[in-house]
Interface confidence: low
């Protein structure tokens, strides 16, 4: 339904508060280096303009597209050239090329200072003094650091952030109330950002078909009682929502997400029995709840898949008539029967089925040719099962920190060209699969673990894409979305790698390490471990363990010393010498 003024339409649908918040997110995700005050000024100007269009949709410029209006506004920033360099060239282009240009310049790893949390009293004072600015600052800081964060979900995070301050700033022990809530929001936010980044990568790098296949599999697992036609409708709508958000169309995205939540709740009887509680919540909570809802129970006595997809004489006829619909049905039927499989495994099975039909439906005896197709699934299913079993045993044996270290060594040996901060970040996140998934029973381990690993490996892929240094990473990231994890798992030690020159500075530590949190201290040690492996890729795990144990003892000793700095200087030299000797550097 066409509207005279798109900006007026969205303002009325979303309301002023959400409109302003979403425009701020959009601008901060595009111009990640701009100061907060500049963005607030731009948002206020856009909001005032939108109000004139609500009053009179025929007013000047109200008929322009949102991309045109927003792009024109962004291009008024005076410091565009000196702050963003070649991104300023986007402003010479016309829509839709201009928006595409802005999208291409989004930076997954912007050069921004780490967010330091102020004292609780300072935060509470700021919250009370100017609640609106305080919450806008939260949206701005998250959006500029996470340029693909799912905007309507960020509104939900902001609502929880506000609730935490409202409650805790009145509490007797403000810190005890607030800090755990902020930690939880931070961790959930990072996870949410990474999950959304995979959806956008899927759409942008592998296309709508790849995303739709993912959505069919996931929604069929979640809503196994829903008919195929119902799942297909939800997939189409969900694809539109995510295409919009990944494309920077945040107002349309938020509006369409609200419509989708409304539709799901109005039709929950034909979708899932698990939606009742979600549908009683306010909009932002409702949408979040639906996105996280547990899988419904599988319908009783589902017939064997073989009848329709192997034994039937009409397989090739049905396939030829509508390939993607037939494959979609296969994926739907397989996924609703297998909540115990990861989505990526289900997609590998569907791909194997498609490849078999492509080959067999052109053969002399198609049925004879594809009769054993399900036998080809067995090794595909067993590979992730075995890998997860092994790694969960290893995790249970080692604990999270040492498990992360084992992965750090493993991945540094596979792709030693990748930057040390990226290897540390990615390996730490890969290692979290243990505490996240190994506690689950067998039936939930694979969907938890392998789909989480897909999210983490996508972080590696997007960070590597910015500055490519390894052909092996590029190959695993670009060849197949669903085979990324098996591709990385299969990588052996990179024998072509020339060890890094030894640099004592890399292993020089100071007294400031003593005041770091346990997490930060771990990161320091893990950074040193990666550097050790880069210097000595053939070092055995025993050698590395010995050096790391010595390092831990050195830090502990010097942090207890009276003259810490002298201890770090003198003992540090001895440690470097001993490590060089131990590793034969």
């Amino acid at each position: 339904d066409a509207h005279k003024s798109e900006v007026a339409h969205r303002f009325k649908d979303l309301g002023e508060e959400n409109f302003k918040a979403l425009v701020l997110i959009a601008f901060a995700q595009y111009l990640q280096q701009c100061p907060f005050e500049d963005h607030v000024k731009l948002v206020n100007e856009v909001t005032e303009f939108a109000k004139t269009c609500v009053a009179d949709e025929s007013a000047e410029n109200c008929d322009k597209s949102l991309h045109t209006l927003f792009g024109d506004k962004l291009c008024t920033v005076a410091t565009l050239r000196e702050t963003y360099g070649e991104m300023a060239d986007c402003c010479a282009k016309q829509e839709p090329e201009r928006n595409e240009c802005f999208l291409q310049h989004k930076d997954d790893n912007p050069n921004l200072p780490r967010l330091v949390r102020p004292e609780v009293d300072v935060m509470c004072t700021a919250f009370h003094d100017n609640e609106e600015t305080f919450l806008k600052k939260y949206l701005y800081e998250i959006a500029r650091r996470h340029p693909y964060f799912y905007a309507p979900e960020l509104l939900f995070f902001a609502k929880r952030y506000k609730a935490a301050f409202t409650e805790c700033c009145q509490a007797a022990d403000k810190a005890a109330c607030l800090l755990p809530k902020l930690d939880e929001l931070r961790d959930e936010g990072k996870a949410s950002s990474a999950k959304q980044r995979l959806k956008c990568a899927s759409l942008q790098k592998f296309g709508e078909r790849a995303f739709k296949a993912w959505a069919v599999a996931r929604l069929s697992q979640r809503f196994p009682k829903a008919e195929f036609a119902e799942v297909s409708k939800l997939v189409t709508d969900l694809t539109k929502v995510h295409t919009e958000c990944c494309h920077g169309d945040l107002l349309e995205c938020a509006d369409d997400r609200a419509d989708l939540a409304k539709y799901i709740c109005e039709n929950q009887d034909s979708i899932s029995s698990k939606l009742k509680e979600c549908c009683e919540k306010p909009l932002l909570e409702k949408s979040h709840c639906i996105a996280e809802v547990e899988n419904d129970e599988m319908p009783a006595d589902l017939p064997s898949l073989a009848a329709d997809f192997v034994e039937s004489k009409d397989v090739c006829k049905n396939y030829a008539e509508a390939k993607d619909v037939f494959l979609g049905m296969f994926l739907y039927e397989y996924a609703r029967r297998h909540p115990d499989y990861s989505v990526v495994l289900l997609l590998r099975l569907a791909k194997t089925y498609e490849t078999t039909l492509e080959k067999c439906c052109a053969a002399a005896d198609p049925h004879e040719c594809y009769a054993k197709v399900f036998d080809e699934f067995k090794p595909l299913v067993e590979e992730p099962q075995n890998l997860i079993k092994q790694n969960c045993e290893l995790f249970e044996q080692l604990g999270e920190y040492k498990f992360q270290n084992a992965l750090l060594v493993r991945y540094t040996k596979k792709v030693p060209q990748v930057s040390t901060p990226t290897l540390v970040e990615v390996s730490r996140n890969l290692g979290k699969v243990g505490s996240k998934c190994c506690k689950h029973p067998e039936a939930k381990r694979m969907p938890c673990a392998e789909d989480y690993l897909s999210v983490v490996l996508n972080q590696l892929c997007v960070l590597h894409e910015k500055t490519p240094v390894s052909d092996r990473v590029t190959k695993c990231c670009t060849e197949s979305l669903v085979n990324r994890r098996p591709c990385f798992s299969a990588l052996e030690v990179d024998e072509t790698y020339v060890p890094k020159e030894f640099n004592a500075e890399t292993f020089t530590f100071h007294a400031d390490i003593c005041t770091l949190s346990e997490k930060e201290r771990q990161i320091k040690k893990q950074t040193a471990l990666v550097e050790l492996v880069k210097h000595k890729p053939k070092a055995t795990k025993e050698q590395l363990k010995a050096v790391m144990d010595d390092f831990a003892a050195f830090v502990e000793k010097c942090c207890k010393a009276d003259d810490k700095e002298t201890c770090f200087a003198e003992e540090g030299k001895k440690l470097v010498a001993a490590s060089q000797a131990a590793l034969g550097l």
Epitope: E393, L394, K541
Partner: nanobody, 123 residues
Framework: QVQLQESGGGLVQPGGSLRLSCAAS????????IGWFRQAPGKEREGVSC????????NYADYVKGRFTISRDNAKNTVYLLMNKLKPEDTAVYYC????????????????WGQGTQVTVSS
Amino acid sequence: QVQLQESGGGLVQPGGSLRLSCAASGFTLDYYAIGWFRQAPGKEREGVSCIASSGGSTNYADYVKGRFTISRDNAKNTVYLLMNKLKPEDTAVYYCAAAVLECRTVVREYDYWGQGTQVTVSS
């Protein structure tokens, strides 16, 4: 429950052979290096042989080199020690032990231990 169980010990004449087995239950051996150790009465426990998790790396104590062979069958979740040309000084209780990924030089770094199997070499 995680367990290692040795078997295959017994009485054998000097110059004879035995094959010891170390079977794991409650976990898979794929990610573990397995070491064989022995302890004669009144003596310290000593390393005999070890095989890394990949199976690609094996090592032997000088006193058994050329006579003993270590191997693994991950499908059966078992590691073997084939002992040829046995000598009376090989008499001891033989233990297997598991460590994550790599063989270790220090006995205490092994995570799981079996109960042991007696080997007696005597005429």
